[in-house]
């Protein structure tokens, strides 16, 4: 799997999970989240060469098509596969509220 | 939706469905499929600017992150959303066999 265990240990130009820390205030302009101040969002990036972690029949076909037609622009792309939620604390006036924001953290990637 | 109805009617540089006909023999080197000779596989391509058809909370966050941090390389990517199967006819010796290949045709796209 193209997850932290694999990607953060290996120098990988191909599609892989990349570390990205997002500071809510500085990077998003969000002042409304009290805790955490930021989080490890991560992101997916890198080349998708022939059959590198292709996730669907279509992406495998596209991968093969690109190998045979190297001038083609139709190539798979490195995107998130598994995502996890992030629990945040924010205030509605003086009242604290805990909320789980879905699909905020990328855990693994794929070529799609 | 970034589907044929929208994308094939509009000239769109941003993430959209693109037409792609794949000839099994010529483009994939597959001689084993008897019918059809090829099919409209389509593919997804184009830029994913600020919140253009972002499909998850993470891709929306990443989109906002890129707006505030334009030097960042962490940007969403244009990939397939809805896929459909393709029915093919092939032969096992002299015996015809009909098979449904899943996720072969891209029907719509998203920024992920």
């Amino acid at each position: 799997a193209l997850d932290a265990a694999y990607c953060f240990r290996n120098v990988q130009d191909n599609c892989c999970l990349r570390p990205l820390y997002i500071d809510f205030k500085r990077d998003l302009g969000w002042k409304w989240i009290h805790e955490p101040k930021g989080y490890n969002a991560n992101f997916c990036a890198g080349a998708c060469p022939y059959l590198w972690s292709s996730d669907t029949q279509h992406s495998r076909v596209l991968s093969l098509y690109n190998t045979i037609n190297p001038e083609a622009s139709a190539s798979p792309c490195c995107v998130s596969q598994d995502l996890e939620p992030l629990t945040i604390l924010y205030y509605i006036g003086k009242t604290p509220k805990i909320e789980q924001l879905s699909n905020m953290i990328v855990k693994s990637c794929k070529c799609s | 939706a970034l589907d044929a109805a929208y994308c094939f009617r509009n000239v769109q540089d941003n993430c959209c469905l693109r037409p792609l006909y794949i000839d099994f023999k010529r483009d994939l080197g597959w001689k084993w499929i008897h019918e059809p000779k090829g099919y409209n596989a389509n593919f997804c391509a184009g830029a994913c600017p600020y919140l253009w058809s972002s499909d998850t909370q993470h891709s929306r966050v990443l989109s906002l992150y890129n707006t505030i941090n334009p030097e960042a390389s962490a940007s969403p990517c244009c990939v397939s959303q809805d896929l459909e199967p393709l029915t093919i006819l092939y032969y096992i010796g002299k015996t015809p066999k009909i098979e449904q290949l899943s996720n072969m045709i891209v029907k719509s796209c998203k920024c992920s």
Partner: antibody, heavy 120, light 108 residues
Framework: DVQLVESGGDLVKPGGSLRLTCVAS????????MHWVRQAPGKGLQWVAY????????YYADSVKGRFTISIDNSKNTLYLQMNSLKTEDTATYYC?????????????WGQGTLVTVSS | EIVMTQSPASLSLSQEEKVTITCRAS???????LAWYQQKPGQAPKLLIY???SRAPGVPSRFSGSGSGTDFSFTISSLEPEDVAVYYC?????????FGQGTKLEIK
């Protein structure tokens, strides 16, 4: 320069529907919580609803809950207020406003307002 | 919900006079969950004071705010002709956000 421009106000019969639009410019729209506030003719200000961009967390005043829906198109820098089952007491000038940063906060920028009249 | 009671409902003062408007909350807001707005006829409200005492950018120094808990006040140190408007207090300590009923300020 920060600008908020509302539109969509009209004369509508009781029980009818209307959608208000607020287009924002001059700042990173998705960074600030957005509110709708209304003002009946010759009366004071009444808060209606808020939405947190990107995460789409919304909250409503009891008087409009179940009838009004606040929504946002982050890519178009646009805030909406879908108003259904309108009552005569919904007659007011509707303002969109941006908070300083917190969910409940002072509102540092307001639109010019759009007038909704509910009458038979 | 928190009820905000503003007084007086209206006042008429001479130019250069000091203006004081008070706002009382039905329950404690703490020290910083109060804002003051100015609304001129046919215009949207304009933020003057937030956090009970902080002036919004571009607001003249003659406008000030103070108070905490349930009692807050808004002051114009020297009334100018352009200050003719309705002034509102707003609490944001609790949901729903509520406003005072407004104070109409006129010049004699």
């Amino acid at each position: 320069d920060v600008q908020l421009v509302e539109s969509g106000g009209d004369l509508v019969k009781p029980g009818g529907s209307l959608r208000l639009t607020c287009v924002a410019s001059g700042y990173t729209f998705s960074s600030n919580v957005m509110h709708w506030v209304r003002q009946a003719p010759g009366k004071g200000l009444q808060w209606v609803a808020y939405v947190i961009p990107i995460v789409d967390i919304a909250y409503y005043a009891d008087s409009v809950k179940g009838r009004f829906t606040i929504s946002i198109d982050n890519s178009k820098n646009t805030l909406y207020l879908q108003m259904n089952s309108l009552k005569t007491e919904d007659t007011a000038t509707y303002y969109c406003a941006r908070t300083l940063g917190l969910v409940l906060d002072a509102m540092d920028y307001w639109g010019q307002g759009t007038l909704v009249t509910v009458s038979s | 919900e928190i009820v905000m009671t503003q007084s007086p409902a209206s006042l008429s003062l001479s130019q250069e006079e000091k203006v004081t408007i008070t706002c009382r909350a039905s329950q404690s807001l703490g020290s910083s969950y109060l804002a003051w707005y100015q609304q001129k006829p046919g215009q949207a409200p304009k933020l003057l004071i937030y956090g009970a005492s902080s002036r919004a950018p571009g607001v003249p120094s003659r406008f000030s705010g103070s108070g905490s808990g349930t009692d807050f006040s808004f002051t114009i140190s020297s009334l100018e002709p352009e200050d003719v408007a309705v002034y509102y207090c707003q609490q944001y300590a609790d949901s729903p956000i509520t406003f005072g009923q407004g104070t109409k300020l006129e010049i004699k």
